[in-house]
């Protein structure tokens, strides 16, 4: 388990309930040993994952883990959907599980739903 393979710790079936108009950071936790791999984000369109170009991304370091962050400034209703990060390491592509953003458009919601309501989706 403690190998020097690159690992991407996005959880299978994970999701985030967020609101349009808010800022949001989508994190891809990356474990690597010597050299930080090149990491990219893509958004699922059916079975195809379309690479996100020209988006604001950044790195954050925490103990023995790095995070490749996709910034939403702000979240748009069209950001609803599933995302995946992938790392290019030693000419191999390592893909994460997908994570889903459930975006509530506050214009169409009279008030923000509770966390319980969001979780029941």
């Amino acid at each position: 388990k403690e190998s020097c393979d690159v690992q991407l710790y996005i959880k299978r079936q994970s999701y985030h309930s967020i609101f349009a108009g808010d800022p949001f950071k989508l994190e891809c936790p990356v474990k690597y040993c010597a050299h930080r791999p090149q990491v990219t984000w893509c958004k699922l369109n059916g079975t195809t994952c379309v690479k996100l170009e020209g988006r604001h991304t950044s790195w954050k370091q925490e103990k023995n883990l790095s995070f490749f962050i996709l910034h939403f400034e702000p979240v748009l209703p069209s950001d609803n959907g599933s995302y995946r990060c992938s790392a290019n390491f030693l000419s191999a592509i390592i893909e994460s599980h997908s994570t889903t953003l459930y975006v509530t458009d506050v214009k169409s919601a009279s008030e923000r739903p509770s966390k319980d309501e969001m979780a029941s989706r």
Epitope: K1, D5, V6, Q7, L8, Y9, I10, K11, R12, S14, Y15, H16, S17, P29, K31, K63, L65, A87, I94, E95, S96, H97, S98, K115, A119
Partner: antibody, heavy 121, light 112 residues
Amino acid sequence: EVQLQQSVAELVRPGASVKLSCTASGFNIKNTYMHWVKQRPEQGLEWIGRIDPANGNTKYAPKFQGKATITADTSSNTAYLQLSSLTSEDTAIYYCALTYYGSSQYYFDYWGQGTTLTVSS
Amino acid sequence: DVVMTQTPLTLSVTIGQPASISCKSSQSLLDSDGKTYLNWLLQRPGQSPKRLIYLVSKLDSGVPDRFTGSGSGTDFTLKISRVEAEDLGVYYCWQGTHFPQTFGGGTKLEIK
């Protein structure tokens, strides 16, 4: 080495509530799901539900909706299972289990030693 | 819920002999990501469960290679090529493809 520490036993009166804890060492629970599993005496295993400690999102088996509440405290690396309105049917061993995720791999490696809950007047 | 049916209920085996446990699911465990989230666990007497096999056939670290997992779709098998004394306990199949996650009823392996 990853370890999950649970209290050994709890004796609770019918109608009361109880909160069981599971503390992880050797791994940050934010990068995992924490599951709870029930095992009644001389019976099989039942999945109660899970939490994503990174954001508090929970999922429960329909049978345990309303009976079980799973929470997590990332500062203490601890997950909790609260059981309400206890009856003799809730007498069981409750295991916590940690799902460890790497890139598109699935691990369900680590189990606590279990807490024996006895509901009796 | 996906029903996981294990057979046999009890298996009595002589040390050194092979053993086989079947697990059938009420629907296919092939996920949309192309993987099959089927695990095998062993619960030794008085202990918590321990996973032996994940994704149908991948052995956990430290698990002897006398254990093999196979199958696809709805039919899965755990085989032990030569049973040893430490293998006794209850074996469970467990699926994580569909919500809620479900376990088989267990197969008790006894040593003759």
